[in-house]
């Protein structure tokens, strides 16, 4: 029972995490214009992995895709790659874990096969989560570096009174979604790996041993005991738990407008 719960919960947590990673990857708000200590602009800029957007005070929003591959910074390409690898691994992990779920019976699949699949999906979730966390962290580091660079030359004097304002970018909502989602996927993966230990039966057959007592010749033959580890559920009398957990997809909602401080 505990194994089923751990495995099911691991699956659900990973599912939510991967949905979050997909949402974060698609979101436009990876970096948003820094409004603090800045002249108040009637135009708000924000950028994602795939396009950059401008929302005017009028409410008009214009987004432009990055239609070049070679012209983009290597770091951005690396972040894209990490997020995509995370999504792909997570998706494969989900597919594998569905068949590995203890509450789902597929033909005459052995517990050992389910244990292996659970471990495989768990490792995939862990790597997926790490990819997402790494991707988001690389992007965040890039933002911090650029932020302080642009702060250093925030105002570049041009012929006395004329000044050029450099737009500074700070952390967008997608970064937080990505960090949380990556963490959830990672936790889900760890839970799957823990569940795997409870699923895997350690076949330890004790050989028949003869004990010779003085006066009587009696042979004690203990039957082949199965030593179960950890969460040890009786492998002979399995219970099937139907109706896996339902999850609600994360709804990504964008604010209708930005406040200009």
């Amino acid at each position: 029972m505990a194994v089923t719960a751990c495995q099911g919960l691991g699956f659900v947590v990973s599912l939510i995490g991967i949905a979050g990673i997909i949402a974060a990857t698609c979101m436009d708000q990876w970096s948003t214009q820094d409004l603090y200590n800045n002249p108040v602009t009637a135009v708000f800029n924000y950028q994602g992995l795939w396009r950059s957007c401008v929302r005017e005070s009028s409410g008009f929003t214009e987004c432009r895709g990055y239609f070049t591959l070679l012209g983009l910074p290597a770091m951005l390409q690396a972040v894209r790659a990490l997020m995509i690898v995370g999504i792909v691994l997570g998706a494969i992990g989900l597919l594998v874990s569905i068949f590995a779920l203890k509450c789902i019976r597929i033909g005459s699949m052995e517990d050992s096969a389910k244990a292996n699949m659970t471990l495989t999906s768990g490792i995939m979730f862990i790597v997926s989560g790490l990819c997402a966390i790494a991707g988001v962290s690389v992007f965040a580091n890039m933002l911090v570096t650029n932020f302080w660079m642009s702060t250093a030359n925030m105002y570049t004097g041009m012929g006395g009174m004329v000044q050029t304002v450099q737009t500074r970018y700070t952390f967008g909502a997608a970064l937080f979604v990505g960090w949380v989602a990556g963490g959830l996927t990672l936790i889900g993966g760890v839970m799957m790996c823990i569940a795997c230990r409870g699923l895997a039966p350690e076949e330890t057959n004790y050989k028949a041993v003869s004990y010779h007592a003085s006066g009587h010749s009696v042979a004690y033959k203990p039957g082949g005991f199965k030593a179960s580890t950890g969460f040890g559920s009786n492998t002979k009398n399995k219970k099937i738990y139907d109706g896996g957990a339902r999850t609600e997809d994360e709804v990504q909602s964008y604010p209708s407008k930005h406040d200009y401080v």
Epitope: Q33, P39, V40, T41, A42, V43, N45, Q47, S52, C53, V54, E56, S57, S58, G59, F60, E62, R64, V162, Q163, T164, V165, Q166, T167, S256, K257, D259, Y260
Partner: antibody, heavy 118, light 113 residues
């Protein structure tokens, strides 16, 4: 077609308050911010502030923060600007104007001539 | 606040002449996000409200004659009337649409001989 209708003139006494109106028609009122602009006789244009009719979020020019209060009535598609503690300096033509993409004012009312006199 | 400086304050020309007027802002009006300049030109004829001519520094509003052309970027902008007509008698204002509060230039008065 888009129209912004304003009363032609208002005459008020110094120290009093006045509420100027701007009735919008020909478009979805809540989709566009409404701006107010002041023009003193023979002078240039001064932006007072704007309001988002969908949620009444406002931006003010600090110069007019204590002078003007912007409101809207969605049911009648009308924007209002209340001016308080009026002095002769407030005598001017007040325009309402719709904010469109490019943050430009694409449609203007005919203006209300406010005269502050005792 | 952003200061918009227009020059000349007035100019007198004959019909058919080419006219240019300048507008300078105290800070750049170029938005890095979409590479657009948030500067607008308005025309105000006597006794009328201002009329939108050009937005995003160079985009002509629909219905505006093509003799009106906006140019410039960053802090320096120009409005050009290729062939002045008698009906162009008006005051022309430039406006900062990038920073709050929105600010207008003092205007350039165009007079016809």
């Amino acid at each position: 077609q888009v129209q912004l209708q304003q009363p032609g003139a208002e005459l008020v006494k110094p120290g009093a308050s006045v509420k100027l109106s701007c009735k919008a028609s020909g478009y979805t009122f809540t989709r566009y911010r409404m701006n107010w602009v002041k023009q003193r006789p023979g002078q240039g244009l001064e932006w007072i502030g704007n309001i988002d009719p969908s949620d009444s979020e406002t931006h003010y020019n600090q110069k007019f923060k204590d002078k003007a209060t912007l409101t809207v009535d969605k049911s009648s598609s009308t924007a209002y600007m209340q001016l308080s503690s009026l002095t002769s300096e407030d005598s001017a033509v007040f325009y309402c104007a719709r904010l469109n993409y490019g943050n430009c004012f694409d449609y203007w009312g005919q203006g209300t001539t406010l005269t502050v006199s005792s | 606040d952003i200061v918009m400086t227009q020059s000349p304050s007035s100019l007198t020309v004959t019909a058919g002449e080419k006219v240019t007027m300048s507008c300078k802002s105290s800070q750049t009006l170029l938005n890095s996000g979409n590479q657009k300049n948030y500067l607008t030109w308005y025309q105000q004829k006597p006794g009328q409200p201002p009329k939108l001519l050009i937005y995003w520094a160079s985009t002509r509003e629909s219905g505006v004659p093509d003799r009106f052309t906006g140019s410039g970027s960053g802090t320096d902008f120009t409005l050009t009337i290729s062939s002045v007509q008698a009906e162009d008698l008006a005051v022309f204002y430039c406006q900062n649409d990038y920073f709050y509060p929105f600010t207008f230039g003092s205007g350039t008065k165009l007079e016809i001989k």
